[in-house]
């Protein structure tokens, strides 16, 4: 069994500022630790590269709703 | 509604280097990715790098690594091209370029273009 | 790199006449999660940059004439000019953005015959 306490933490030390379309986005995960700096989003991309947003930010909200819409939407 | 506008047409001689500028208005540079796309006369249209966000850094076509640095001064919101060891092949019109929309990796909105001339 | 292949290199079409330019990429550039396909087509009259003209390979461009469409999906797609007018004439270009670095066909000529 992992060791919870020992087990590494990812954590967001800096966000990108820079605006993403959702459509190079695959999925995302949120980052709550208390062990981490800041609260924060990582999006994993199309192409599988991960980046640090800030969940305050509309459009990082935005692609949040976007994703979450598309995994509840069954593929026909 | 974002606008570019490009620095004036240059000419050069071989070895020199030329560096192009390009203002961003509309919108701030920070929250763009901006990216420098080349044209030789009467040829295609060819990309020669720009900022990636998915890397977080600024990425070159391979062609023109170890020749090319792109800058960015956010105080002014210009974004700057620099291409070293100038030859003839170079002549071209550069283009900056942006998807205003957000990083997606085409572009829909264009400088308008500047023409580097290098002769001897 | 991704090779992109557009053909023909050029076209003559009468006015009023259907215009088809064909554009292969070397590998796809469709991403099946959300059934996207990274394609770009653009339109550069002489002296100007390019102008984005579809995107997604079938979405039009907002003030982009309805004659204009895009179609296709992973590595084979098509811009069709239905009824092809005077101010068509141009260059036009695709471009596939799944991966970096972006590449870009070599360019078709449509002109009038």
């Known amino acids: 069994q992992p060791d919870a306490i020992n087990a590494p933490v990812t954590c967001c030390y800096n966000f990108t500022n820079r605006k993403i379309s959702v459509q190079r986005l695959a999925s995302y995960r949120r980052i709550t630790s208390s062990k981490c700096p800041k609260e924060a989003v990582i999006f994993k991309t199309i192409v599988a590269k991960e980046i640090c947003a800030d969940p305050k930010q509309k459009w990082v909200q935005d692609s949040m709703d976007h994703l979450d819409k598309q995994t509840q939407t069954p593929k026909t | 509604q974002v606008q570019l506008v490009q620095s004036g047409a240059e000419v050069k001689k071989p070895g020199a280097s030329v560096q192009v500028s390009c203002k961003v208005s509309?919108?701030?540079?920070?929250?763009?990715?901006m990216h420098w796309v080349r044209q030789a006369p009467g040829k295609g249209l060819e990309w020669m790098g720009g900022?990636?966000?998915?890397?977080?850094?600024?990425i070159y076509a391979r062609k023109f690594q170890g020749r090319v640095t792109m800058t960015e001064d956010t105080s002014t919101d210009t974004v700057y091209m620099e291409l070293s060891s100038l030859r003839s092949e170079d002549t071209a019109v550069y283009f900056c370029a942006t998807d205003s929309r957000g990083y997606s990796g085409y572009f829909d909105n264009w400088g308008q273009g500047t023409l580097v001339t290098v002769s001897s | 790199d991704i090779v992109m292949t557009q053909s023909p290199d050029s076209l003559a079409v009468s006015l009023g006449e259907r215009a088809t330019i064909n554009c292969k990429s070397s590998?796809?550039?469709?991403?099946?999660?959300?059934?996207?396909?990274?394609l770009v087509w653009y339109q550069q009259k002489p002296g100007q940059p390019p102008k984005l003209l579809i995107y997604w390979a079938s979405t039009r461009e907002f003030g982009v004439p309805d004659r204009f469409s895009g179609s296709g999906s992973g590595t084979d797609f098509t811009l069709t000019i239905s009824s092809l007018q005077a101010e068509d004439v141009a260059v036009y270009y695709c471009q596939q953005y799944y991966f970096s670095p972006w590449t870009f066909g070599q360019g078709t000529k449509v002109e009038i015959k």
């Open positions: 590998q796809s550039v469709l991403y099946s999660s959300n059934n996207n396909n990274y």
């Open positions: 509309g919108d701030t540079l920070t929250e763009l990715s």
């Open positions: 900022f990636d966000p998915e890397d977080g850094e600024t």
